[in-house]
Interface confidence: low
């Protein structure tokens, strides 16, 4: 049985050209992570894998970077980084957990947000 | 308009002790992520630590084990517990919510001296 629940930043703005960090945490369930997805979309970002470690998709390697932790910063953002992003904890015996995080990235010099978790 | 204000900074001798809060105002902590940063003179802004509302933290490896954070959602604030302080932690530290910055305080300085 699936026990377990994902925090996440929730729903989050930022200003174009700039930075923004997403990060998720499984909670409640003693699986083991044997590894993380973060999408965007239908788009692969990153892989971070229990045993071999971070994996950037080459598209995205010049503007992802690893972490903190299991998270992901997104660096030099456009308006058309504005979507849904996934986390995929895959874990053992569980099964897959998946957290949404929704990220506007606007142009105006003032980014405003109304952050919220999303707990599925 | 959200506001952050920093304070508890100051100068403080090598393996001293500090305690950051940072309070929000405005619609900012309903997200329930805060983080800390700091800018060390001549050096870019660096993640320091931060906390979601459930009270998971995250490190930088260079502060790990030496500094705490936590959060007071009910007083909209976050803390940041600096022990062990090395000269290289001098720098402004700030707050902010969500990653890089939706919103950033003004910072308070921490200087580590002898």
């Known amino acids: 049985m699936m026990t377990g629940t994902i925090e996440t930043t929730g729903n989050i703005s930022a200003e174009k050209g700039g930075s923004i960090i997403l990060q998720c945490h499984l909670s409640s369930t003693t699986a083991q992570v044997t590894q993380v997805n973060w999408e965007q979309q239908d788009q692969l970002l990153a892989i971070c894998n229990a045993d071999l470690g971070w994996h950037i998709s080459p598209s995205f390697k010049d503007r992802v970077a690893p972490g903190p932790g299991l998270g992901l910063t997104l660096q030099s953002l456009t308006v058309n980084d504005t979507g849904e992003y996934f986390c995929i904890y895959h874990t053992y015996p569980d099964g897959t957990y998946t957290g949404r995080i929704f990220l506007e990235v606007l142009e105006s010099s003032v980014a405003e947000h109304g952050a919220r978790f999303q707990i599925p | 308009e959200v506001q952050l204000v920093e304070s508890g900074g100051g100068l403080v001798q090598p393996g001293g002790s500090l305690r950051l809060s940072c309070a929000a105002s405005?619609?900012?902590?309903?997200?329930?992520?805060m983080g800390w940063f700091r800018q060390a003179p001549g050096k870019e802004r660096e993640w320091v630590a931060s906390?979601?509302?459930?009270?998971?933290?995250w490190y930088a490896d260079s502060v790990k084990g030496r500094f705490t954070i936590s959060a007071d959602n009910s007083k909209n604030t976050a803390y940041l517990q600096m022990n062990s302080l090395k000269p290289e932690d001098t720098a402004v530290y700030y707050c902010?919510?969500?990653?890089?910055?939706?919103?950033w305080g003004q910072g308070t300085l921490v200087t580590v001296s002898s």
């Open positions: 902010t919510t969500v990653g890089y910055g939706d919103y």
């Open positions: 405005g619609n900012t902590f309903s997200g329930g992520f």
């Open positions: 906390v979601l509302r459930g009270g998971y933290t």
